[in-house]
């Protein structure tokens, strides 16, 4: 184009529907220039105008020839241009922020603007740039892009931004611009101008303030604090750590904390100091609630459900910031909230949920929530299978009879639809406890009753009970223990009876033993002793307990003696014993030795013995009648160990084995013995009966049984040269080679001649007795042989 003609034609559009084309006027033209603009391929395509721009409807694709005639005082000039959509620039109108607001509590800015989409012919993507600036110096903080779509009508757009710095700390500015990315437009696309700026600021009063206040944040986060102050801030500390100050407008400062550590329960202090003052805020750095662990629901009473859980990892947030829990039951839609005052018991939390009529299956969701987040756990329970009964209370025991009692107790809850399995612990004094299981139908009124049989009369029992449901979830705790004495019954057996004739043979002494408690079945009050023969029965007067002996004057005819024990309920079956022994001429006295504590007696089986065997024993040295104690053993026995606290080592006892048939006893064996043999306590007394030039005859006496302390097995006789009252060694001193020893094992021997001696020589003689328990003490004597003739 010539310099004197219109030049530099440029076209822009802000809505894709109208192009705004403008050109530069020819040089030297003044105000009074008219223009004729003609567009080829358009009907009515010429326009007369007085300015250097024209708005034309957007042209369809292709090239168009534009002719611009400039008509001015000194002639006219014409320019031709080729116009194509590709030469047109799309520059959207400058947007306008309709509203900028702030939520200071969350440090969030809220932005609202209109996209003016109604002026655009088709849908287009729009890119918005939003610029956030901070402080009076308008430092850029954030530049973000935000995508929207034009949809043919004016649309209001909202955008929010959470500031890393509390909004109170500094003025914040916002401006926006847009870029329309139209697929239907092939020309150049450009950004709009930035919108007029909008700002948000907090109006401080004269007081110094620190922000944020009481903020709860996630451990490991970054956070900015600031101090709005009229005086110069000297330092800032988090805990004890100094932080570098970031200067804001005026005297205001900020600090930035990176990767914040978990707070103590009282929070973390952030402190700003000035020359004269100190200002603080508290931050609570913690964790969102962990998924509730080990959620478990059970019921004690089928009236309310108790759900327990463990909170898992500690959140480090307490008080109003602590985790709150809500237990929701999804079938019913009902829920309960955990009150923070209900402090956890040993690390676990619990909630009660009222059971709903006719609902057995419960689908619980436990929601945990704190300022940093939420979590949940779910559990599906059939509550009839999760019964953990209360501890049975009001536990009582009542007699039914001497071997049965009635137990009653209280178990709160409505259990009409289920059965209980209850365990009764039965403990007799000094014996192992027994446990019995009973199944009981659950009831609505909480009172339960069960009968317990197969007990012993007149026995102290300790009872306690615990219950679970038949489907078993957990045993209840044990009830309190109840001690109970069952009632008396008649004694189940007659007393263990024995008899002995008095030493003069005129009286029969009857002995019996107290009945053991499990046979007495009550307190024995007295005994009846009677004596019967073919002709008559004679009863003695009643003998009160604790006398266990009676004496009857009897001739040598055969009588049957009966002994009956009586308690408050009645009499025992009689114990019968014949007065006379069945003779046995074929008896030898045997020796027996025990095993330290007792003595083992054995015998051959005898089919004739139909009642029992009796072993009787007594101290050999005691006078008649010989009875210390006796023991009955069943007729099928062939051995027994006799033990007694009265047995002493080194004491000789007589043992008698009797066999019984038809209440008559026959002596089968007679034994003497020791529980344990000891060495004799004395030496035999000995004398020299005769002396010659080459021999000595010695004679000794028996040692009394009491001092023998075992079965005599022999004598040891020592002799050797030696004189009384000299320094020459005694016979029994060691190392003497000329000592001679004789072991006399024939215990009937009472004399000994020592030959081959030297005449007129002093000899030292020593005698000792021995048993299997050891060698007794020595007795010694000095003898001088006669002179050789």
């Amino acid at each position: 184009q010539k310099k004197g003609a219109p030049h530099d034609l440029k076209c822009v559009t802000n809505n894709l529907q109208v192009w705004d084309c403008y050109w530069k006027a020819p040089s030297g033209t003044g105000r009074g220039t008219d223009y004729e603009v003609c567009i080829e391929n358009r009907s009515h395509s010429c326009y007369q105008l007085e300015k250097t721009n024209i708005k034309i409807p957007a042209l369809s694709h292709g090239d168009y020839e534009i002719t611009i005639n400039s008509l001015h005082d000194f002639g006219s000039s014409t320019s031709k241009f080729t116009l194509n959509e590709q030469n047109v620039s799309l520059i959207p109108d400058t947007p306008e922020i309709l509203n900028l607001s702030a939520d200071f509590s969350t440090s969030t800015l809220y932005l609202k603007w209109n996209d003016r989409g109604s002026v655009f012919p088709h849908h287009s993507n729009v890119i918005w740039e939003i610029k956030i600036l901070r402080k009076e110096s308008m430092e850029l903080v954030k530049l973000v892009t935000h995508n929207t779509t034009l949809n043919g009508k004016d649309t209001l757009h909202h955008w929010s931004w959470a500031s890393d710095m509390p909004l109170e700390c500094a003025i914040h500015f916002v401006e926006i611009r847009c870029y329309i990315d139209s697929l239907h437009f092939s020309g150049r696309k450009e950004w709009s101008d930035w919108s007029p700026v909008k700002n948000i600021s907090w109006m401080p009063d004269s007081q110094t303030k620190v922000f944020p206040q009481d903020k709860v944040i996630l451990v490991g986060s970054d956070i900015t604090f600031c101090c709005i102050s009229q005086e110069k801030v000297l330092s800032a500390l988090i805990g004890h750590t100094n932080c570098p100050l970031i200067h804001l407008d005026g005297e205001n400062v900020a600090i930035k904390i990176h990767n914040i550590s978990v707070s103590a329960s009282s929070g973390t202090n952030v402190v700003f100091t000035t020359e004269d003052n100190i200002f603080g805020t508290v931050i609570f750095a913690g964790y969102p609630p962990d998924t509730p662990q080990q959620l478990n629901c059970e019921t004690h009473d089928l009236k309310e459900i108790l759900c327990r859980w463990n909170p898992g990892r500690a959140t480090a947030l307490v008080g109003p910031r602590a985790t709150s829990y809500t237990l929701l039951e999804s079938f019913s839609g009902k829920y309960v909230r955990f009150k923070r005052a209900e402090a956890p018991t040993n690390g676990s939390y619990q909630l009660f949920f009222q059971m709903l009529p006719n609902q057995e299956i419960y689908n619980f969701t436990l929601n945990a929530h704190n300022p940093l987040g939420r979590s949940e756990s779910t559990i599906l329970v059939n509550i009839t299978e999760k019964v953990y009964p209360h501890t049975p209370t009001s536990f009582k025991v009542k007699d039914i009879n001497s071997t049965a009692v009635k137990l009653s107790w209280h178990l709160p809850g409505n259990f009409a639809k289920i059965n209980f399995l209850c365990q009764i612990e039965i403990k007799k004094s000094n014996t192992v406890q027994e446990q019995r299981n009973v199944t009981i139908k659950g009831v609505e009124n909480s009172s339960y009753l069960v009968a317990l049989d197969k007990l012993n009369p007149y026995t102290v029992y300790t009872f306690r009970i615990r219950c679970s449901t038949e489907t078993f979830w957990k045993w209840s705790k044990w009830s309190n223990k109840k001690q109970h004495l069952t009632t008396e019954a008649i004694p189940s057996k007659g007393p263990d009876t024995w008899r002995e004739w008095s030493s003069d043979g005129k009286n029969l002494i009857i002995y019996w033993k107290p009945l053991p408690i499990n046979e007495a079945n009550g307190k024995i009050l007295s005994y009846n002793v009677s004596c019967s023969s073919d002709e008559e029965t004679q009863s003695l007067s009643e003998i009160p307990d604790p006398q266990h002996k009676a004496e009857i004057q009897l001739d040598k005819n055969d009588y049957i003696i009966s002994v009956v024990a009586k308690n408050s309920v009645g009499s025992s079956p009689p114990s019968k014993i014949a007065s006379m022994e069945i003779p046995n001429d074929d008896l030898k006295i045997e020796q027996v030795v025990g095993m330290g504590k007792g003595i083992l007696l054995t015998w051959h089986y005898d089919p004739n013995m139909t009642c029992d065997y009796v072993i009787k024993w007594c101290n050999s040295s005691r006078s008649e009648p010989c009875l210390m104690d006796w023991r009955k053993v069943p007729s099928n026995s062939t051995e027994t160990v006799i033990e007694s606290d009265q047995f002493r080592p080194g004491v000789r006892y007589n043992f008698f084995l009797y066999g019984c048939r038809n209440q008559g006893y026959q002596l089968l064996r007679s034994m003497i013995g020791y529980i344990e043999e000891l060495a004799p306590t004395v030496a035999p007394n000995f004398t020299v009966e005769d002396t010659s030039a080459d021999s000595i005859l010695v004679k000794w006496e028996d040692i009394p049984v009491e001092e023998l302390r075992g079965f005599l097995r022999g004598y040891l006789f020592y002799f050797g040269k030696g004189e009384r009252d000299t320094s020459k060694m005694r016979v029994l001193e060691s190392g003497r080679s000329d000592i001679k020893v004789k072991n006399i094992t024939d215990i009937s021997q009472k004399t000994l001649r020592i030959a081959d001696l030297q005449g007129k020589t002093s000899y030292h003689l020593v005698l000792r007795a021995y048993t299997d328990g050891g060698v007794g003490p020595e007795k010694s004597m000095y003898v001088v042989t006669k002179e050789n003739s």
Epitope: D214, V271, D276, I278, F279, G280
Partner: antibody
Framework: QVQLVESGGGVVQPGRSLRLSCAAS????????MDWVRQAPGKGLEWVAV????????YYADSVKGRFTISRDNSKNTLYLQMNSLRAEDTAVYYC???????????????WGQGTLVTVSS | KIVLTQSPGTLSLSPGGRATLSCRAS???????LAWYQQKPGQAPRLLIY???NRATGIPDRFSGSGSGTDFTLTISRLEPEDFAVYYC?????????FGPGIKVDIK
């Protein structure tokens, strides 16, 4: 057990000086911030001054700023209040108080002494 | 300076009654920095509540604290004879640390 015992109170003429002491025992004195609080006869409580656990920072109420000085000797477990240019309105029972949190700043006062009476009168 | 006002000035109640004591701050304060003290005649004050709602060691659970921002409350659920005293609130979040004027709880 924690004990705070104030001493040094008495009757003093306006314009004169007085030094109060507070002997601490039963806790790690050097780990706690310490404060002075006063109470005029028949009136409420008024905070006077605070000193940090390590003695690095001290702050005062406007009414005593420039006249009173708080200090501490951690080796002697003792807190002091030097009171200069005393006025009639300084008449009060002066309490020393320990801050609640070990090694923390900005704490409530969990232990107090029984107080010492300062009377400013001509 | 943060000014604390307490109301009512005096509260006349019977033993067993419920006492509700109010403390208002001239500007918003962090609940972490509000305490309540009890003072009996001739005695030093005693810390009851700190951080607005936490009971100090050895304080019975009939004492409870609540509130945030500018309004805080001390509640004594059932007054015992030993609870009749003067109660002060205090802010310790920015110096000068300030006390309220106190509320006297006396026997009706």
């Amino acid at each position: 057990q924690v004990q705070l015992v104030e001493s040094g109170g008495g009757v003093v003429q306006p314009g004169r000086s007085l030094r109060l002491s507070c002997a601490a025992s039963g806790f790690t004195f050097s780990s706690y911030g310490m404060d002075w609080v006063r109470q005029a006869p028949g009136k409420g409580l008024e905070w006077v001054a605070v000193i940090w656990y390590d003695g690095s920072n001290k702050y005062y109420a406007d009414s005593v700023k420039g006249r009173f000085t708080i200090s501490r000797d951690n080796s002697k477990n003792t807190l002091y209040l030097q009171m200069n240019s005393l006025r009639a309105e300084d008449t009060a029972v002066y309490y020393c108080a320990r801050e609640l949190w070990f090694g923390e700043l900005l704490s409530p006062f969990d232990f107090w002494g029984q107080g010492t009476l300062v009377t400013v009168s001509s | 300076k943060i000014v604390l006002t307490q109301s009512p000035g005096t509260l006349s109640l019977s033993p067993g009654g419920r006492a509700t004591l109010s403390c208002r701050a001239s500007q918003s304060i962090s609940s972490s920095y509000l305490a309540w003290y009890q003072q009996k005649p001739g005695q030093a004050p005693r810390l009851l509540i700190y951080a607005a709602s936490n009971r100090a060691t050895g304080i019975p659970d009939r004492f409870s604290g609540s509130g945030s921002g500018t309004d805080f409350t001390l509640t004594i659920s059932r007054l015992e004879p030993e609870d009749f005293a003067v109660y002060y609130c205090q802010q310790y979040g920015s110096s000068p640390f300030t006390f309220g004027p106190g509320i006297k709880v006396d026997i009706k």
